[in-house]
Interface confidence: low
Amino acid sequence: MLRLLLALNLFPSIQVTGNKILVKQSPMLVAYDNAVNLSCKYSYNLFSREFRASLHKGLDSAVEVCVVYGNYSQQLQVYSKTGFNCDGKLGNESVTFYLQNLYVNQTDIYFCKIEVMYPPPYLDNEKSNGTIIHVKGKHLCPSPLFPGPSKPFWVLVVVGGVLACYSLLVTVAFIIFWVRSKRSRLLHSDYMNMTPRRPGPTRKHYQPYAPPRDFAAYRS
């Protein structure tokens, strides 16, 4: 078993003779709302080329965050195999990666990479200085079991509003019910404590429930 880490310059058929694509990136971006646009500008026109642009996370570029694949005969493909919520847009000499639902612990350095596959010669880029993405704002907690896009803010606002209105209605209804119930209970109690004209055994079982009243207080 050969365990090799082969650098690009070991491939004679795909060597690029000093013809590396240069990449420009912003030195730093701040993601206040857990989203950010990272633009990778290239010294090369990508129009009608077959290319693979990717964004990598970490000093060692160990995590491939997002891929934009362009082919002159196909629609642009944008995807992430590592669970990032990403989108991409293509310019003539740029690819913009739009990352959403970033977590605070994903603050890191991000590198743009580009490979032009066709037509020849094969080209890739000189390693750029990278962009430090500093994630601030809402502290999203990653859910490893069910990773997925969080609800848009306006949906939460609408749901919150509906719940608030519902709570208010329930509270008002409860107060109205309570007032009516109290009034009904008072009327019911007064009726129960009126001196019966024909006292009979049928009323006796109500007596323990009637609070004692001072009828002298009703006299003028």
Epitope: I14, K113, Y122
Partner: nanobody
Framework: EVQLLESGGGLVQPGGSLRLSCAAS????????MSWARQAPGKGLEWVSW????????FYADSVRGRFTISRDNSKNTLYLQMNSLRAEDTAVYYC?????????????MGQGTLVTVSS
Amino acid sequence: EVQLLESGGGLVQPGGSLRLSCAASGFTFDSANMSWARQAPGKGLEWVSWIEAPGVQTFYADSVRGRFTISRDNSKNTLYLQMNSLRAEDTAVYYCARSPFGPLYGFDYMGQGTLVTVSS
């Protein structure tokens, strides 16, 4: 331990076809990008083709584009290279390799290779 075992090489006449296979083990094959590379006698290693983990995206060296087809069967942990319209210059030892990133960013593991000889 990562293992890549190539098979299917042999002697074939110009214009003929061969199908190479690579049995992979020791890693999660369905999440790994894979490549085929070759080394002709007395020459350096040449990258031939690359396929992404899901099997949707493929890339080819200009010398084989339109003649070779890379594919994979993730359920069988196997990588394939269908070679048609073979030429004398395709004679080489063909290596199956795991590619951590894009097509041009090299390999981290390679198999022992299988020899393909195109000759009349």
